[in-house]
Structure formats: structure tokens, C-alpha cells
């Protein structure tokens, strides 16, 4: 009989094509507990039976099947905090980053039907339970109601609300975006008994109008009110109702403290404290101002007092307050501490504890490292992230403090865990910590465990992405590597994804993938099959991200680095790699190029138009090109304002427009898409205005009606087929 | 002691205006919503207006465009300016504390008459 | 609006006896926002239901509330003779709240 012919396993492997990485062949799952106590939790199975879970019996059982699920077409539910009634949220419409629309059903769990009678108006433009039994809080047509059970008729607490006006429970556009994060802006208080709200008025704000195609005669016209950097912003005003008897008070309006409502200013976030306490942050209009405000309901004057003494400010001398966002207080069971990460004296990231006042703070971490976020406080322990382990910034790990000892003492919880696979992870928590999940995003695959609070032991793998792995077994990927350049004073860390057979000794085109915008972090040992994993796999390409000044977690001289200049260190510092890069002696200098979306759209713009001749070819997608034409919290966090008293000259500086003599000697490809509604369709405009009347030849494309994300599917396919032949073409690799 | 005295009542021509005033005292003024109730001779209670405790307005269809009711929270007193007065306008007018119900103090009262 | 419907009209009495007053709305009013209200000849209304059920504070506790979405009761348990007045049911469910026309409680 013949000798069986062995093949070595590598030949067996296939790069990865285009066709995958469209098709989301190779994506990955998280498992995160829908927790709705110490020790159960919900989740939606594969095949949408809502499963109830029992940590400590062992017990599980559908809880709403799938039959129910689809008799709405519901593709999500919320379970009502005395388990009477679930919410099926149907006819998902997006609207901005967060925002959607819903159509939603109110399921008796008692009873096996439906609630009828009262049925919830739609589109709802948000929907949530009370902590505590079932009242419902919704938002329809910029109004407040309040139901005080599925059942009954609503109560309608806000009638200001008004379409492209004024907003009551929702964000506006930049606040949506820029500021809260979140669809919503409103908030229980623990007991359910009162309901804050924010109320933004737009009225004065200038309307950003831009055409939407769709299939009709004539287009469309969307109207956003939108401040760009200098524009009249939102006007805000902070409420709060008595849930019990809203029809008796009426909604009380809660005081800006007098420091921030001097001048122009934001509101920033809501916390609750206690049932009759809260927690408010104010910010400046000039962003390096905060004050925390602590308020009490007054029973005597019903009304909600926050005294002087309770203001709590933070200021940054360097650059802005916070990193992204300025962080939120967890507090401690006193309700009246709390812990909170700001900037220490050195300019790194830390916890702190406030007693009585910021001057008076207690630092509790503290390292050329910093704590990124407080996941939860509880009686004894304190867990939180950080990149404090080995000095990588791009790690994630969990760590709780001890903080019933003295001095507290500090565990990483998931450092040695799978220390190979496992060096970003973030976490959910059941109420008190009893348990957690902790999802782990790389370097290797994702993985979801669930965890013991007090001992921190492994019970149950969540999801552990078997497919997956199975799938990937007979993949040729690239090899990742994250190190550090230095540069005279200056440390950057990068990503390189080399092709598979990388050989040092010979000569690989260079794409550098740049985002790079202020408080961001491209830099991550996190797990990902994409575009750019492709382009090294089957084309061949190394792949390089750096993050340079400006970006995230390395302390506030790097991160302010920046500061009221955009435009000028990202860019250098991208160059810088490069130079870096091509010494180290495997890259074709002939061919480099370098792309980004977005923020990283400007920057890569900026770096085809430096002049340097390092840069064979590149590509913007929907790029800034002015910081005047986006919205004037974020431009003005990081500039300052667009007057001449203030920082016009470097707005006009920093254009893309002033540089479109310098694309002469690059192949420059622009897209953008006609409906982007955060980046707006008007810098890419300018951008090709500019390069005709300097007589620049580029290519461009438009995706018609998408936005920001470019995200329908065949737009997508389009997209990276698109970019993917520009590069082969400028790369000169064969088809 | 929570007391709340109406004034600004009498005898006016229709097509004339009063202005009610509403003097509180025994409570937090300014932390409160209130509103004006009415009542014809010999006949039910009619809610008319009413107003937030941070300025927002309410009022019955009946009245709205004619009647505008006001609150100055550093003197405790609410206010309703009653402008076109009709005779159906007739009525004893209270000021209550509370917005939509729960109108848990009144006045005592007092009267409008619309007649030529 | 929601029309509130009070009945009977006028309840004739005796002190000591029960007083049952009804109020029905033309649509559902949840419990949160119904309240009863008592108007002596010459006086301001006084609040003593809030909530369908709860006595308003220094109210006897011989007045007491019932009822839910459409039907609403007040019953005086036992009637003492500061009781005989107008009573008026209100919601505060919707914008413009409205009252019942009242319902008068007499000495037989």
C-alpha cells in the first residue's frame, strides 16, 4: 500500500482573504451576565430563549422564550426589578452613535400575555424600569412619562419637549456624542422614588443641513442642531421629580453652582448617592474647570439644596480636566466619600479618596502607570483597571484594593490568570460583587469567565470561543508584536503585524494605520482578525500602529502634549515611526503608505502633506479637516476657541485646506460618506476644493446616504475592496 | 403655620384685566409649583393655571393667550395678570399649592365679577 | 380632558351613618393621581384623599379611599356633623386637571 505523503502543517494553512474579513468569518463573542442580583443573572441564548441563572443553586430555566421574543420580533428585553414584567424592544432604528428609536411591548410574566390597554406609544426614543418594583420611565417625542405600573395610564412629566428644540431625558447631538455618551438623560434614584432629568434647549443653536438621497424624487434634508467649535452651545438645566406624586410639586430644578454658572458651562454627569442624595458634575465651557456638587433633598423646604461645602473642584493647569471625559465618582457605603481618579502631582492617572475636600484627598494608587476606571466599591473592596503590570499601556488588568485594611493592601486579580492569552480585560459585576464575569479581549482569544468576589476563584468559563479557535487552526495570521521607540526624551509604543513568513533580512511595504486623536489608544494587546490583519496575511504588508503624543494612559505630559496645537505632535510623531521603522531595516522605503478614519483621517492626511517624501500614497476616510467645522466640545477641549483672542490662529493653522500643495507628490485617496452627521460631509468638500484650485490631482469616493461608520454592508464590501486596490495599486501588488 | 392670602379681586368691565396677587408664607416658596383654582357662584372647582417652581407655565385652554400667571420668589407671592376678561371669567379665584392635583393648601379666596 | 362623573348628586344622611360617594372618569386614572377634596359654604376646599387611598395629613381616619382605573370611592365611615359638605373627586393624571361637579352630603 502507499506510503502516506506528510505535509507539514504550514502548508496546509491559507491566508486570510477579504472575502472573511467581510464576511465576519473570523469574529469573535463575549459573554457578559445580565445581572439582576447578588447571584443570578439573564442571558440571551443563540438561539433567544431569555435564560435565568442561578450562581449558587446550580438552577436555570428559561425565563421568556424565544417564541415569545419572536412573536414582537423583539431583539432585546429588560426585566422589571420585581420580575412581574419583561420589555421587548422591537423595530430597532438607529439614529446617532447611541440613540435609536424602539417599538416597545410589556410582557406579563404572571400572567404568560402581553399587557394590554395603555400600550406604550412609538417610536419610544428610551425606555427603563425603576430600580425597585415597575414603574416605567419613557421618553417619546422629547417628553418625559412615568408609569407607575405597565398597566396604567402615563404621566406626563416634561411638556417642553419639542423636535430639534428642546430635549428632556435625551441627549442633543453633542451631548449625545461628545459629552454624556449614552442615549439617555435621566436616572433613577436607588429607591425609585425620585426621577433626575436633564432638559437641553437648542433653540439657538445653529442647524448643521445636509441632503439624504434615499429612493425619492427629490432628496431629503436632515436638520441637526449642531454647535461647531464657537457656536452657541445647548443650554441646560437639571431636574428632578417625586415619582410618588409628580403631579403635586412638579418637577424642582436643581442649582448650578455659582462658579460654573458664571460663564458659559456644561453639565457632564449624574450620580446617585443615596435615595435622598446626588451627585452632579458641572464643566466649564474652557474645559480645565470641573466642580462636583453634592445634593440633599430638603424635606422641610422640598427642595434640593446643594451647599458650598459640598463643591468639590477639579482643575487642570496643563491641558483639560480628565482624559476623555472627566472621570465619575464611586461612593462609598458613608454616601458621603467617595473615590475618584484624577490627575497627581506628577500628571498620572490615579484614585484618590475624598473625604471633605479635593485638597484633603487621600491618593491610594500611584506610579508612572495609570488607574483607568472604578468598577465597584463595596464595603471592603475597591476593584479597578489599570496598565500598571509590566509597563505596557496597552494592557488592561483587574484589581481590587482592600480597603477595610489598613494601609489597604492590593491584588491583581487577573495578571497571572492566562497570562499568554489574557492581558485585557475589563469586568461586570453582580450588585454587592458577590460575583463577576471578566471578559478578557487578548492578545489571544477572547475568553469570559465567571468569578467568585471574595476569593476571586474561577467557577465556569462563560465562552471561550472553541469555534472559533477551530476555525482559525488552519489560518495563516500574521505575528503581532508591541514594543517601544524611543526618540530623545520621547517613548512611543507600537503595534506591528508582520505578514506570515516574515523574513527580516528581506524588504515589506509599510502601512501605517494611525487614529491618534487626543485621550485615544491605538496600542492594545487585544485580539482582532480585520482588514488590516488581511492586508499582512495575503498581501504581505506590515502593518504598524503608533500611538504618539496626545494619546491615552502614559500621564499628562504626554497626553497634553497636544494641547491647543492639533495637528502638529500626532503627525511628527507618526514621521518619527516611520523613520524609526524604515532603520530597522526591513522596510521598502519606496513603499509606505498610511491611512485613518476619522480623527485618524486627519492625521493621515496631514502626514501624506508633510512634505517629507516618506509617504508613497495614503487614504482619508471621512477625515476632519478644520477644527472649526466639528462640535465645539470637543474641538474646544483641545483648542480653546476659534477667536482671535483665544487660539484662532492655530484653528487656521491646522487645516487640512492650508496643506494642499504638499499633496502634489502623493497618491491621495478621500472618502467620506454624504450622510455623516458627526464628521460632516463639508471637510471632506473643502478638502477637494482645495486640492482643485491648487490644481492636485487625488481620487475620491462618496458613499451615498451612509454615515460616520460607513457601516451598511455593501458599503462596507465597497469600501475595503476599494481602499484594498488603491493600496495594491500604490504598493504595486498583483491582483 | 402654611397661609397663603389671595388680593387683587373686584369689579371689572369685560374686555378689562386685574392682576391677582397670592401672598405665601409657612413654607419654601420657591421650592414649590403652584397654581390658581376657580369657582363660579354655585358652581365646581376649575383648575386654571398653574406654575413650576423654576418658571414653567400651565394653563386651561379656556384662559390660555389671556391669562399669564408669574411667580416672584424673593417677595413669596404668585401672581395671575387676567387680560380680555370675559363675564364667564366670573368666579372666586384661589391660589393653591401644588401643579396638577394634590392641591394639598388654598386660600381663602377672592372675588372676580366681569360685568358691565 | 377627563370628564369626572360624581354620584348621587346630593347624599341625604344622618350623623353617625356611612357616606358612600362615587366618581367615575371617562378614561383610566391611575391610583397615584386621584384625590378627594371637602368644601364647606364660604371656605377654600380642603385636600383629604391623595393617591385614590391615602388620608391627607390630619384627616380622620373614619374618611377612606377605594378604586382603581375608571371607579373611585370615598366613604365616610361614620358621619359626624363637621362632615356635611361638598366633596370633590380630581385627577391630576393629564393637563388641564379637572374636578367632579361634587357631590353634596346633607343632614336628613
Known amino acids: 500500500r502507499p506510503s502516506r505523503v506528510y505535509k507539514p502543517e504550514g502548508n496546509t494553512k491559507r491566508a486570510l482573504t477579504l472575502k472573511d474579513i467581510l464576511n465576519g468569518t473570523f469574529s469573535y463573542k463575549t459573554y457578559f451576565p445580565n445581572w439582576i442580583s447578588e447571584q443570578e443573572y439573564l442571558h440571551q441564548s443563540e438561539d433567544d430563549n431569555i435564560v435565568f441563572y442561578n450562581i449558587e443553586t446550580r438552577e436555570s430555566y428559561i425565563i421568556l422564550s424565544n417564541s415569545t421574543m419572536k412573536s414582537v420580533n423583539a431583539t432585546d428585553y429588560g426585566l422589571s426589578p420585581d420580575r412581574q414584567f419583561v420589555y421587548l424592544e422591537s423595530d430597532y432604528s438607529k439614529l446617532w452613535r447611541y440613540s435609536y428609536t424602539a417599538t416597545y411591548y410589556i410582557y406579563d410574566l404572571q400572567n404568560g400575555e402581553f399587557v394590554r390597554g395603555y400600550e406604550l406609544p412609538r417610536p419610544i426614543q428610551y425606555l427603563c424600569w425603576s430600580p425597585v418594583g415597575s414603574k416605567l420611565a419613557y421618553v417619546y417625542q422629547n417628553n418625559i412619562y412615568l408609569k407607575q405600573r405597565p398597566g396604567d395610564p402615563p404621566f406626563q412629566i416634561t411638556y417642553t419637549g419639542r423636535e430639534n428644540r428642546i430635549f428632556n431625558g435625551i441627549p442633543d447631538w453633542v451631548y449625545e456624542e461628545e459629552m454624556l455618551a449614552t442615549k439617555y438623560a435621566l436616572w433613577w434614584s436607588p429607591d425609585g422614588k425620585f426621577l433626575a432629568y436633564v432638559e437641553f434647549n437648542d433653540s439657538d443653536i445653529p442647524i448643521i443641513a445636509y441632503s439624504y438621497y434615499g429612493d425619492g424624487q427629490y432628496p431629503r434634508t436632515i436638520n441637526i442642531p449642531y454647535p461647531k467649535a464657537g457656536a452657541k452651545n445647548p443650554v441646560v438645566r437639571v431636574f428632578i421629580v417625586d415619582t410618588t406624586y409628580p403631579h403635586h410639586v412638579g418637577p424642582m430644578e436643581v442649582p448650578v453652582p455659582e462658579m460654573i454658572a458664571s460663564s458659559d458651562y456644561y453639565f457632564s454627569w449624574l450620580t446617585w448617592v443615596s435615595s435622598e442624595r446626588v451627585c452632579l458634575q458641572w464643566l466649564k465651557r474652557v474645559q480645565n474647570v470641573s466642580v462636583l456638587s453634592i445634593c440633599d433633598f430638603r424635606e422641610d423646604w422640598h427642595a434640593w439644596e446643594c451647599p458650598k461645602n459640598q463643591e468639590h473642584v477639579e482643575e487642570s493647569r496643563t491641558g483639560w480636566a480628565g482624559g476623555f471625559f472627566v472621570s465619575t465618582p464611586a461612593f462609598s457605603q458613608d454616601a458621603t466619600s467617595y473615590y475618584k481618579i484624577f490627575s497627581d502631582k506628577d500628571g498620572y492617572k490615579h484614585i484618590h479618596y475624598i473625604k471633605d475636600t479635593v485638597e484633603n484627598a487621600i491618593q491610594i494608587t500611584s506610579g508612572k502607570w495609570e488607574a483607568i476606571y472604578i468598577f465597584r466599591v463595596t464595603q471592603d473592596s475597591l476593584f479597578y483597571s489599570s496598565n500598571e503590570f509590566e509597563g505596557y499601556p496597552g494592557r488592561r488588568n483587574i484589581y481590587r484594593i482592600s480597603i477595610g485594611n489598613s494601609p489597604p493592601s492590593k491584588k491583581c486579580v487577573t495578571c497571572h490568570l492566562r497570562k499568554e492569552r489574557c492581558q485585557y480585560y475589563t469586568a461586570s459585576f453582580s450588585y454587592k460583587a458577590k460575583y463577576y464575569a471578566l471578559v478578557c479581549y487578548g492578545p489571544g482569544l477572547p475568553i469570559s469567565t465567571l468569578h467568585d468576589g471574595r476569593t476571586d476563584q474561577e467557577i465556569q468559563v462563560l465562552e471561550e470561543n472553541k469555534e472559533l479557535e477551530n476555525s482559525l487552526r488552519n489560518i495563516q495570521l500574521p505575528k503581532v508584536e508591541i514594543k517601544k521607540l524611543k526618540d530623545g526624551g520621547l517613548t512611543f509604543w507600537y503595534k506591528m503585524i508582520l505578514p506570515p513568513q516574515f523574513d527580516r533580512s528581506k524588504k515589506y511595504p509599510l502601512l501605517i494605520q494611525v487614529y491618534g486623536g487626543p485621550c485615544s489608544q491605538s496600542v492594545k494587546s487585544v485580539f482582532a482578525v480585520n482588514w488590516i490583519t488581511y492586508l499582512a496575511s495575503k498581501e504581505g504588508i506590515v502593518i504598524a500602529l503608533v500611538d504618539g503624543r496626545g494619546t491615552a494612559f502614559q500621564g499628562d505630559k504626554f497626553l497634553h502634549a497636544v494641547y491647543r496645537k492639533l495637528g502638529v505632535y500626532e503627525v511628527e510623531d507618526q514621521l518619527t515611526a516611520v523613520r524609526k521603522f524604515i532603520e530597522m531595516g526591513f522596510i521598502d522605503e519606496e513603499r509606505i503608505a498610511i491611512w485613518g478614519w476619522s480623527y485618524g483621517g486627519y492625521v493621515s492626511s496631514l502626514a501624506l502633506a508633510s512634505g517629507t517624501g516618506l509617504f508613497k500614497c495614503g487614504i482619508a476616510v471621512a477625515p476632519v479637516s478644520s477644527w472649526e467645522y466639528y462640535a465645539s466640545i470637543y474641538s474646544e477641549r483641545f483648542m480653546g476657541l476659534p477667536t482671535k483672542d483665544d487660539n484662532l490662529e492655530h484653528y487656521k493653522n491646522s487645516t487640512v485646506m492650508a496643506r494642499a500643495e504638499y499633496f502634489r507628490n502623493v497618491d491621495y485617496l478621500l472618502i467620506h460618506g454624504t450622510a455623516d452627521d458627526n464628521v460632516h460631509f463639508q471637510n471632506s468638500a473643502q478638502i477637494a476644493k482645495a486640492l482643485v484650485n491648487a490644481q492636485v490631482d487625488f481620487q475620491a469616493m462618496w458613499y451615498s446616504d451612509q454615515n460616520h461608520g460607513i457601516l451598511s454592508g455593501r458599503s462596507q464590501n465597497h469600501l475595503y475592496t476599494h481602499m484594498t486596490h488603491f493600496l495594491k495599486q500604490c504598493f504595486s501588488l498583483s491582483d | 403655620e402654611v397661609q397663603l392670602l389671595e388680593s387683587g379681586g373686584g369689579l371689572v368691565q369685560p374686555g378689562g384685566s386685574l392682576r391677582l396677587s397670592c401672598a405665601a408664607s409657612g413654607f419654601t416658596f420657591s421650592s414649590h409649583a403652584m397654581s390658581w383654582v376657580r369657582q363660579a357662584p354655585g358652581k365646581g372647582l376649575e383648575w386654571v393655571s398653574a406654575i413650576w417652581a423654576s418658571g414653567e407655565q400651565y394653563y386651561a385652554d379656556s384662559v390660555k393667550g389671556r391669562f399669564t400667571i408669574s411667580r416672584d420668589n424673593s417677595k413669596n407671592t404668585l401672581y395671575l395678570q387676567m387680560n380680555s376678561l370675559r363675564a364667564e371669567d366670573t368666579a372666586v379665584y384661589y391660589c393653591a399649592k401644588g401643579w396638577l392635583g394634590n392641591f394639598d393648601y388654598w386660600g381663602q379666596g377672592t372675588l372676580v365679577t366681569v360685568s358691565s | 380632558e377627563i370628564v369626572l362623573t360624581q354620584s348621587p348628586g346630593t347624599l341625604s344622611l344622618s350623623p353617625g351613618e356611612r357616606a358612600t360617594l362615587s366618581c367615575r372618569a371617562s378614561?383610566?386614572?391611575?391610583?397615584?393621581?386621584l384625590a378627594w377634596y371637602q368644601q364647606k359654604p364660604g371656605q377654600a376646599p380642603r385636600l383629604l384623599i391623595i393617591?385614590?387611598?391615602t388620608r391627607a395629613t390630619g384627616i380622620p381616619d373614619r374618611f377612606s379611599g377605594s378604586g382603581s382605573g375608571t371607579d373611585f370611592t370615598l366613604t365616610i365611615s361614620r358621619l359626624e356633623p363637621e362632615d356635611f359638605a361638598v366633596y370633590y373627586c380630581q385627577q391630576g393624571q393629564v393637563i388641564p386637571p379637572t374636578f367632579g361637579q361634587g357631590t353634596k352630603v346633607e343632614i336628613k
Open positions: 378614561q383610566s386614572v391611575s391610583r397615584s393621581y
Open positions: 393617591g385614590a387611598s
